[in-house]
């Protein structure tokens, strides 16, 4: 397993609809054709997997149907969008990139992006 540099922004603000996007850039040492991207959430020293996708270079990222993540790729850069976030989901979101094929296998883990989520104000009761 060889190490690879992964860059991501330190901070991002989620929209009032609970959508946050951030870029994950990796310094590919070779010509990878198959790449796996995993988003991890670190909170209170616990790390959990948020979502993961494997894609072929030049193709779209395909997450599972029930995933809260979507993404697009362009060269060595992946634009990740996480939806359905609430205030309790505020935390450090780490981008993990694996170059699966061809060998050698490379692994890179970013420093993490702090996503700040604020729950929207509840709509006032309406007479209509």
């Amino acid at each position: 397993c060889k190490a690879m540099h992964v860059a991501q922004p330190a901070v991002v603000l989620a929209s009032s609809r609970g959508i946050a996007s951030f870029v994950c850039e990796y310094a590919s040492p070779g010509k990878a054709t198959e790449v796996r991207v995993t988003v991890l959430r670190q909170a209170d020293s616990q790390v959990t997997e948020v979502c993961a996708a494997t894609y072929m270079m030049g193709n779209e990222l395909t997450f599972l149907d029930d995933s809260i993540c979507t993404g697009t790729s362009s060269g060595n850069q992946v634009n990740l969008t996480i939806q359905g976030l609430r205030a309790m989901d505020t935390g450090l979101y780490i981008c993990k990139v694996e170059l699966m094929y061809p060998p050698p296998y490379y692994l890179g883990i970013g420093n993490g992006t702090q996503i700040y989520v604020i729950d929207p104000e509840p709509c006032p009761d309406s007479d209509f």
Epitope: A10, V11, L13
Partner: antibody, heavy 115, light 109 residues
Framework: QVQLVESGAEVKKPGASVKVSCKAS????????MNWVRQAPGQCLEWIGL????????NYAQKFQGRVTFTVDTSISTAYMELSRLRSDDTGVYFC????????WGQGTLVTVSA | QAVVTQEPSLTVSPGGTVTLTCGSS?????????PNWVQQKPGQAPRSLIG???NKASWTPARFSGSLLGGKAALTISGAQPEDEAEYYC?????????FGCGTKLTVL
């Protein structure tokens, strides 16, 4: 390499507005928040607020709330800061800055507010 | 609103070592505050030295290093040079905003 280039110096009258631009290059503009920072003559650096160019989400320091507006034009990778109802104590240098794991600053725009 | 505290001034001899600190009124500074250190010389724009605790900019000399020390962010200069004489600002991130300290005036004498 990453560069942030700001617009030129401005002289304004009290009560007027000023709009400063910051052109970014050398990185994915929509991928990183852009901050605006003020430095009054002989004073400390003061955070004005930030904008997320990807979704236009802004957060302004309470002190500037209601007087400042941030916008971006992603097609030309440029961020803008507009400050209205200018007062003499708004005189200072205004910086755009990408504050991050790797941080970058613009060269600054001097705004002078004088009657 | 959090307050970020720095030493108003420090003096170091050429070739000596000095540590500048950056504290937070809300408690211990952590990596989640993404401490940023900025150098500013008179009449010049600020220049980032270190971001996210210990990530050096490409132009940052090796003698500068960032760390967390006793609940504070710290900038250490090992082997100070006359050109290091400047104002040093620290910025900390608090969930959705940055707060700057009022700077440390470093004199190399």
């Amino acid at each position: 390499q990453v560069q942030l280039v700001e617009s030129g110096a401005e002289v304004k009258k009290p009560g007027a507005s000023v709009k400063v631009s910051c052109k970014a290059s050398g990185y994915s503009f929509t991928g990183y928040t852009m901050n605006w920072v003020r430095q009054a003559p002989g004073q400390c650096l003061e955070w004005i607020g930030l904008i997320n160019p990807y979704n236009n989400i802004t957060n302004y320091a309470q002190k500037f709330q209601g007087r400042v507006t941030f916008t971006v034009d992603t097609s030309i990778s440029t961020a803008y800061m507009e400050l209205s109802r200018l007062r003499s104590d708004d005189t200072g240098v205004y910086f755009c800055a990408r504050l991050d794991y790797r941080s970058y600053w613009g060269q600054g725009t001097l705004v002078t507010v004088s009657a | 609103q959090a307050v970020v505290t720095q030493e108003p001034s420090l003096t170091v001899s050429p070739g000596g070592t000095v540590t500048l600190t950056c504290g937070s009124s809300t408690g211990a500074v952590t990596t989640s505050n993404f401490p940023n250190w900025v150098q500013q010389k008179p009449g010049q724009a600020p220049r980032s030295l270190i971001g996210g605790t210990n990530n050096k900019a490409s132009w940052t000399p090796a003698r500068f290093s960032g760390s967390l020390l006793g609940g504070k962010a710290a900038l250490t200069i090992s082997g100070a040079q006359p050109e290091d004489e400047a104002e040093y600002y620290c910025a900390l991130w608090y969930s959705n905003h940055w707060v700057f300290g009022c700077g440390t005036k470093l004199t190399v004498l």
